[in-house]
């Protein structure tokens, strides 16, 4: 999987969208690693 900063951000956006945004406040691009996906 792509692990660049931009890929991580887009992937997290998709995850947040699918979860309805119901995730921890610290679940942000700069504070998650690729393993979080």
């Amino acid at each position: 999987a792509c692990d660049t900063a931009t890929c991580v951000t887009h992937r997290l956006a998709g995850l947040l969208s699918r979860s309805g945004g119901v995730v921890k406040n610290n679940f942000v691009p700069t504070n998650v690693g690729s393993k979080a996906f």
Epitope: C2, T4, T6, L12, L16, T30
Partner: antibody, heavy 119, light 107 residues
């Protein structure tokens, strides 16, 4: 309203260094990566590097061979790009850019900073 | 580094025309491609991410497609305000790289 406001135009001599700032507002600065991109006259956009403002980790374009340094001041929500050993080919418009998810899912760019390198 | 080759370099079309700009990557970048619109003297504006997704606020006449090495930006019905230079970018690998730009003019 999300804004990335960059410092003003600079004129530098060959061999000198330049430091461009990018002040972020309207979002949580440390939550999102900050990129720096430049555009020389008549040339394609060129990515210089990215910083994770949360912990300061950087990734640079190897083309710049250690001449570029990206830093942040978290307390001021400001990113900096310093380019050293300037040459005429570094004459360009320099942009900061950040891809956000909140408050809006969008790729925001600063207004650009013109750096002219001339003897 | 990944080379992104855009074509054409420039094009002239009439209002209402369907316009297609292509971008070819030198190796597989999946769908990790973005498209930007840049008007003279302005910063690039994001249009498309992940090859085919429009950012909120981008008119529906803009669409993107492709995967692997071949990507397309289409404007379904050209408007006068679409006069600009369009750039593709791959972000699958560092360093991110851009196409050389396509300058779009109105006939």
């Amino acid at each position: 309203e999300v804004q990335l406001v960059q410092s003003g135009a600079e004129v530098k001599k060959p061999g000198a260094s330049v430091k461009v700032s990018c002040k972020a507002s309207g979002y949580t600065f440390t939550d999102y990566y900050m990129n720096w991109v430049r555009q020389a006259p008549g040339q394609r956009l060129e990515w210089m590097g990215v910083i994770n403002p949360y912990q300061g980790r950087t990734t640079y374009n190897r083309k710049f061979k250690g001449r570029v340094t990206i830093t942040v001041d978290k307390s001021a929500s400001t990113a900096y790009m310093e380019l050293s050993s300037l040459r005429s080919e570094d004459t360009a418009v320099y942009y900061c850019a950040s891809l956000l998810i909140r408050p809006h899912y969008f790729d925001y760019w600063g207004q650009g900073t013109t750096v002219t390198v001339s003897s | 580094d990944i080379q992104m080759t855009q074509s054409p370099s420039s094009l002239s079309a009439s209002v209402g025309d369907r316009v297609t700009i292509t971008c070819k990557a030198s190796q597989n970048v999946g769908t990790n491609v973005a498209w930007y619109q840049q008007k003279p003297g302005k910063s690039p504006k994001a249009l498309i991410y992940s090859a085919s997704y429009r950012y909120s606020g981008v008119p529906s006449r803009f669409s993107g497609s492709g995967s692997g090495t071949d990507f397309t930006l289409t404007i379904s019905s050209l408007q006068p305000e679409d006069v600009a230079t369009y750039h593709c970018q791959q972000y699958n690998f560092y360093p991110y790289t851009f196409g050389q730009g396509t300058k779009l003019e109105i006939k």
